[in-house]
Amino acid sequence: APVPPGEDSKDVAAPHRQPLTSSERIDKQIRYILDGISALRKETCNKSNMCESSKEALAENNLNLPKMAEKDGCFQSGFNEETCLVKIITGLLEFEVYLEYLQNRFESSEEQARAVQMSTKVLIQFLQKKAKNLDAITTPDPTTNASLLTKLQAQNQWLQDMTTHLILRSFKEFLQSSLRALRQM
């Protein structure tokens, strides 16, 4: 609807009207993905009792999910910006096969699972522009990823449900650690 000259809209405008800086874009993108993961976890936890299960170790044996370790330079003690950035990008690239696995694991949140996957691709792209030492980043082998995907999809129903839960939980933790580290950069 037309607004007469000089008359303000009743909505509160978002205070930030500058184009986002690289760091702001990355921060907002991670928070957007984390919200998506929360929505997916909600469906997973409603559908099964995996979120309260104590049998996680059984399924975890099949998985090699990326985790932050002291040596990665992302924690406050021993923080190293370049090492940490390489770890974040490498970890996200390693998570991609697990996000692909999630694509057929949701009924009501199918589009949300795709949004998390695609938003992660965009996040990697944002981070690539920030990294200087791109040579240190190893990309996962497509053949290895394909056979891992086949193996995960061949698991029984219980293990598949547990795998879905573990991927979401680990990815959430990895992104939260990444967010904390990136805010120090």
């Epitope: 978002a14 930030h16 009207r17 184009p19 986002l20 874009r25 907002k28 993108q29 928070r31 957007y32 993905i33 919200d35 998506g36 929505a39 690239l93 589009e111 949300q112 795709r114 949004a115 695609m118 938003s119 691709k121 965009v122 996040l123 990697i124 792209q125 944002f126 690539q128 990309t139």
Partner: antibody, heavy 120, light 111 residues
């Protein structure tokens, strides 16, 4: 199914402002980012900016940062774009679109567009 | 800004033949094997419709006669075979860098 409803047209006077709406249905409004795109015969398709209704965060193109203000009303699942200090250059079709890859995206779902005509 | 140059500006193709549209980016839109280039079809009075995303992935519900290829700076949309309903304007779009930008469009007409 996912739908983004926009009013068909707005006629506004030079110097005035216009606030157009984009009502979302068929999905959880707070889960996806809404982008706005301008289309003119001369300049083609231009990205204006985006808003995440989940928390109100926005991102603007440098070109439109002083022209457009993006807001969202979660209670009515509606995104809004206000354009200020209108001139004939702002006459265009404005689309809202859902981005499924966050703040930088491609668009599987589009509104039908609002034709804004700036004329005395 | 990344500039996308589409060619040709227009082309006329006979029914059943192949149509090829090119999009050249002023800088690479590649990131770890993902090419952030997408293709849309727009008919008069309609919003654009997503056909191809990430250079080569077919959007759900889009006929298989549409395909996308290319990497880094050079991309192609192919329609084979062309059908009557394909008469429209086709746009490429990149999201490798803000602001997101679109090509100027290629108008496909039927002979």
């Amino acid at each position: 199914q996912v739908q983004l409803q926009q009013p068909g047209a707005e006629l506004v006077k030079p110097g005035a402002s216009v606030k157009m709406s984009c009502k979302a249905s068929g999905y959880t409004f707070t889960n996806y980012i809404i982008h706005w795109i301008k289309q003119t015969p001369g300049q083609g398709l231009e990205w204006i900016g985006a808003i995440y209704p989940g928390n109100g965060d926005t991102s603007y193109s440098q070109k439109f940062k002083d022209k457009a203000t993006l807001t969202a009303d979660r209670s009515s699942s509606t995104a809004y774009m206000q354009l200020s200090s209108l001139t004939s250059e702002d006459s265009a079709v404005y689309y809202c679109a859902r981005g499924d890859a966050g703040y930088s995206a491609w668009f599987a779902y589009w509104g039908q567009g609002t034709l804004v005509t700036v004329s005395a | 800004n990344i500039v996308l140059t589409q060619s040709p500006a227009s082309l006329a193709v006979s029914l059943g033949q192949r149509a090829t549209i090119s999009c050249s980016a002023s800088e690479s839109v590649d990131s770890y094997g993902n090419n952030f280039m997408h293709w849309y079809q727009q008919r008069p009075g309609q919003p654009p419709k997503l056909l191809i995303y990430l250079a080569s992935k077919l959007e759900s519900g889009v006929p298989a006669r549409f395909s996308g290829s290319g990497s880094r700076t050079e991309f192609t949309l192919t329609i084979d075979p062309v059908e009557a309903e394909d008469a429209a304007t086709y746009y490429c779009q990149q999201n490798n860098e803000d602001p997101l930008t679109f090509g100027a469009g290629t108008k496909l007409e039927l002979k």
